[in-house]
C-alpha cells in the first residue's frame, strides 16, 4: 500500500512539475524591467525565451518574436535547449510511469517489469528536473551579470552619449515557476525511484514442495529454497539498472504602483 502511495504521489508531483516546466518555458516573463531606483516610466518591458514584450500604461501590449537563431546569445540558446530537453524527458517519463503505476493493470505485466519502468521514469524525472533547474539558473546568472554591467554603465558618466534609456532587467515570474517546477519534478523522480525498490520482488520462498516418489509417499520440506524470479541469473534482483549516466552534448518587459496605472 505504501509503495502504491509513494508511486502515485511521485507521479502526481512529477506531473505538476512537468506542467510547470512547460508553463515556465512558454512564459514571457523570464526577465522584467527593474523598477527599483529607476525613473518611473509609462512603458514596461519584459522578455521570455521566445519573444520580448512591451506593455504600455495605455494597456497596449506588443510582443515580438526572436525570428533569428544565429543572432541570439549562446546562453539563451543553451537555456532553450535545457528546457526543451527537460520537457521531452519529462513527457517520456510520464508516459512510461503511467504504465508502471501499480494501480493500473495492463495485461499480465509482472511487478518486475513495473519496477523497471518505475525506475526508468524516476531517473527521467530526476534528469528532467535537473535540466529545468539548470536552465533557469543559467538564465538567472545571465541576468545578474547583465544587471550589474548595466548598473555600472549608468554611473560612468556616459549620459549624453547613450541614445536609449538604460533598461535594467531583473528576475521574472517564469524563473520562480521554473525553479519550483524543476524541484517538484526532481522530488517526484526520487519518489518513483524509492517506490521502485518496494515494487521489485526480493525473493519467493517455496515453503512446501511435495515430491512424489514412485514407491512411497514422502513429503520433503527444504529449509528455504530460492526460486528464480524471472530476471535470468539476477535472482536476488538487486540491480536492475545501472545509473545510466547521460551526456547531452547538444546542450549549449494589473501593474504595480509604478507600472502605469
Amino acid at each position: 500500500m505504501a509503495v502504491t502511495a509513494c508511486q502515485g504521489l511521485g507521479f502526481v508531483v512529477s506531473l505538476i512539475g512537468i506542467a510547470g516546466i512547460i508553463a515556465a518555458t512558454c512564459m514571457d516573463q523570464w526577465s522584467t524591467q527593474d523598477l527599483y531606483n529607476n525613473p518611473v516610466t509609462a512603458v514596461f518591458n519584459y522578455q521570455g525565451l521566445w519573444r520580448s514584450c512591451v506593455r504600455e500604461s495605455s494597456g497596449f501590449t506588443e510582443c515580438r518574436g526572436y525570428f533569428t537563431l544565429l543572432g541570439l546569445p549562446a546562453m539563451l540558446q543553451a537555456v532553450r535547449a535545457l528546457m526543451i530537453v527537460g520537457i521531452v524527458l519529462g513527457a517520456i517519463g510520464l508516459l512510461v510511469s503511467i504504465f508502471a503505476l501499480k494501480c493500473i493493470r495492463i495485461g499480465s505485466m509482472e511487478d518486475s517489469a513495473k519496477a523497471n519502468m518505475t525506475l526508468t521514469s524516476g531517473i527521467m524525472f530526476i534528469v528532467s528536473g535537473l535540466c529545468a533547474i539548470a536552465g533557469v539558473s543559467v538564465f538567472a546568472n545571465m541576468l545578474v551579470t547583465n544587471f550589474w554591467m548595466s548598473t555600472a554603465n549608468m554611473y560612468t558618466g556616459m549620459g549624453g552619449m547613450v541614445q536609449t534609456v538604460q533598461t535594467r532587467y531583473t528576475f521574472g515570474a517564469a524563473l520562480f515557476v521554473g525553479w519550483v517546477a524543476g524541484g517538484l519534478t526532481l522530488i517526484g523522480g526520487v519518489m518513483m525511484c524509492i517506490a521502485c525498490r518496494g515494487l521489485a520482488p526480493e525473493e519467493t520462498n517455496y515453503k512446501a514442495v511435495s515430491y512424489h516418489a514412485s514407491g512411497h509417499s514422502v513429503a520433503y520440506k527444504p529449509g528455504g529454497f530460492k526460486a528464480s524470479t524471472g530476471f535470468g541469473s539476477n535472482t536476488k534482483n538487486k540491480k536492475i539498472y545501472d545509473g545510466g549516466a547521460r551526456t547531452e552534448d547538444e546542450v549549449q518587459s494589473y501593474p504595480s504602483k509604478h507600472d502605469y496605472v
Epitope: 524591467q33 525613473p39 518611473v40 516610466t41 509609462a42 512603458v43 518591458n45 522578455q47 520580448s52 514584450c53 512591451v54 504600455e56 500604461s57 495605455s58 494597456g59 497596449f60 506588443e62 515580438r64 547613450v162 541614445q163 536609449t164 534609456v165 533598461t167 518587459s253 494589473y254 501593474p255 504602483k257 502605469y260 496605472v261
Partner: antibody, heavy 118, light 113 residues
Framework: QVQLVQSGAEVKKPGSSVKVSCKPS????????IDWVRQAPGQGLEWMGG????????VYNEKFQGRVTLTADKSSMTAYMELSSLRSEDTAVYYC???????????WGQGTLVTVSS | DIVMTQSPDSLAVSLGERATINCKSS????????????LTWYQQKPGQPPKLLIY???TRESGVPDRFSGSGSGKDFTLTISSLQAEDVAVYYC?????????FGGGTKVEIK
C-alpha cells in the same frame, strides 16, 4: 464614435474644491485609461494624472499630489477629477482625454473652464 | 521631470510651403524593448481641445493628412508639414509619453505669412 463629455464651467473661491466630471461614450469605459490635462489661459498643456477605470489605479503628477484626486464610477461610467485648496493660478480649462497606444491621447473632452476668483 | 523644449515659438510660412517644428527632450524617449520613441505631436486650434496627429514619433494617426510627418529619435524630434494649408494654422505641441510625469512642450504657433 468616441466622445468624452465634460461638466460645465465652474467659478470657485480660493481654498475651495472643484469636481469636474467626464462621461465617455462609444467604447468600453473600463478598457482605456482616462487622463486629465489642464491649460491655463494663453498657456501650454499640463498633465495632471491618469486613472485606470477598470482597477481604480491612479498615477499623478507630483506637482498636484495631495491636491488632486482622480476617481471613476463604473456604474455611471464617469470619471472625476477633484482639485482642492484652489488658488488663482488654478484658473484653467481642464480636459479629460482617453489614453491609447503610444500612451498618446486620441480623444479629448470639450474642456471645463474653472475660474478661481475671490 | 523631463523637459520638452520646442522651437521656434512661432513660425510664419507661406501657403504650400514646408513648415518644420523641432522638439528636444532632456532625456531619450527611445524604449530599448521595442525600439519605439515615445513622443507624440498634437495640433490645437483656438477654442478647441488638442487633436492627436502623430504618436511613436512617426506613426500618423488615422484620418490625419499625409502632409504631416514626424521624424527623429532619442532626444531630437521634428514635425514637418510638407505643404502648409490654411486649416493648418494652429499651435503644435510635442509630448513625452515615456517618463512620468507626461510632459508637453511649450508649443509652436504656426501662422500664414
Amino acid at each position: 464614435q468616441v466622445q468624452l463629455v465634460q461638466s460645465g464651467a465652474e467659478v470657485k473661491k480660493p481654498g475651495s474644491s472643484v469636481k469636474v466630471s467626464c462621461k465617455p461614450s462609444g467604447y468600453t469605459f473600463t478598457n482605456y485609461l482616462i487622463d486629465w490635462v489642464r491649460q491655463a489661459p494663453g498657456q501650454g498643456l499640463e498633465w495632471m494624472g491618469g486613472i485606470n477605470p477598470g482597477s481604480g489605479d491612479t498615477v499623478y503628477n507630483e506637482k498636484f499630489q495631495g491636491r488632486v484626486t482622480l476617481t471613476a464610477d463604473k456604474s455611471s461610467m464617469t470619471a472625476y477629477m477633484e482639485l482642492s485648496s484652489l488658488r488663482s493660478e488654478d484658473t484653467a480649462v481642464y480636459y479629460c482625454a482617453r489614453r491609447v497606444r503610444g500612451n498618446s491621447f486620441d480623444s479629448w473632452g470639450q474642456g471645463t473652464l474653472v475660474t478661481v476668483s475671490s | 521631470d523631463i523637459v520638452m523644449t520646442q522651437s521656434p515659438d512661432s513660425l510664419a510660412v507661406s501657403l504650400g510651403e514646408r513648415a518644420t517644428i523641432n522638439c528636444k527632450s532632456s532625456q531619450s524617449l527611445l524604449n530599448s524593448g521595442n525600439q519605439k520613441n515615445y513622443l507624440t505631436w498634437y495640433q490645437q486650434k483656438p477654442g478647441q481641445p488638442p487633436k492627436l496627429l502623430i504618436y511613436w514619433a512617426s506613426t500618423r494617426e488615422s484620418g490625419v493628412p499625409d502632409r504631416f510627418s514626424g521624424s527623429g529619435s532619442g532626444k531630437d524630434f521634428t514635425l514637418t508639414i510638407s505643404s502648409l494649408q490654411a486649416e493648418d494654422v494652429a499651435v503644435y505641441y510635442c509630448q513625452n509619453n515615456y517618463f512620468y510625469p507626461l510632459t508637453f512642450g511649450g508649443g509652436t504657433k504656426v501662422e500664414i505669412k
